[in-house]
Amino acid sequence: LDSPDRPWSPLTFSPAQLTVQEGENATFTCSLADIPDSFVLNWYRLSPRNQTDKLAAFQEDRIEPGRDRRFRVTRLPNGRDFHMSIVAARLNDSGIYLCGAIYLPPNTQINESPRAELSVTERTLEPPTQSPSPPPRLSGQLQGLVIGVTSVLVGVLLLLLLTWVLAAVFPRATRGACVCGSEDEPLKEGPDAAPVFTLDYGELDFQWREKTPEPPAPCAPEQTEYATIVFPGRPASPGRRASASSLQGAQPPSPEDGPGLWPL
């Protein structure tokens, strides 16, 4: 007795597929092709065993609610359309729904709508409302995302802080001496002139020797970066070795030392 799919039905049930979040209302529309004098309109859910469970009904201008008051049938002003709504849908409301009508004597007729599917999905995290409510438990994925974003922000802040500390400890001076050409020749300020940065890296623990550094080679045509290495007038005490963890403050070179410019 399995009837073939019929191309036309005097009852329509739409939408064919409906997805709502849990807690939202889910509304289908059941429409009659015409308005008979006397009829009963029922709303059903298909059980896993393919049995129909009647949810609510409309009969002769009166609504018959089912056992669960969340299922509501409302006749619209045009008389042909009926809203069939689930108030505050739950996850287990997901399933197959349809509407059916019986037109009462003298000509008793049964009509069934096509089936429609409802999917109720889990509620996603919403922005906090003004009313104080306990924050919902974050899902694993979301938690990971929050931790990741926080880590990146902390990393960026640490980098900024490190940059600031380095800038404070090693201030860049725009003045410096160039050993290019003769001593009397002023520094070139043109676009071709390579900028000279004077960087004081604190005290370096060299083996002390009574020897002046060798003069640097003449300027190469390519751009060369220079650093000023300051040699103290006396051997550095063991407690004043420069290291990554104990950087010394910038100390201007004493006149007798003279600037030592070394290409980096």
Partner: nanobody, 120 residues
Amino acid sequence: QVTLKESGGGLVQAGGSLRLSCAASGRTEIIYAMGWFRQAPGKEREFVAGIGWSGGTTYYADSVEGRFTISRDSAKNTVYLQMRSLKPEDTAVYYCAAQDSVAGTLGDYWGQGTQVTVKP
């Protein structure tokens, strides 16, 4: 052509139960819905219960809602009417009916009927 044959009627005490069956044969593939009507002596035939064959939607007269249950077995081309808490006023000849299309009516085809008598 569709042929319908009822069975399961009989005599029962008030408060008792009966199960009626209606077997369809012939061009059963055209059946869209089936149902039960009854006719008491001196009264008009009245609708009792109906079922849509495709979706299994069910319908009942107010007088039997909650006491009677209609169901179908597609494999056997059979429709059933389980009657519980029977009352003397349920006494009647029960007829099986079939609707052959969306545009048809529940009464396109009729069975011969089966007698149900409920004693007070």
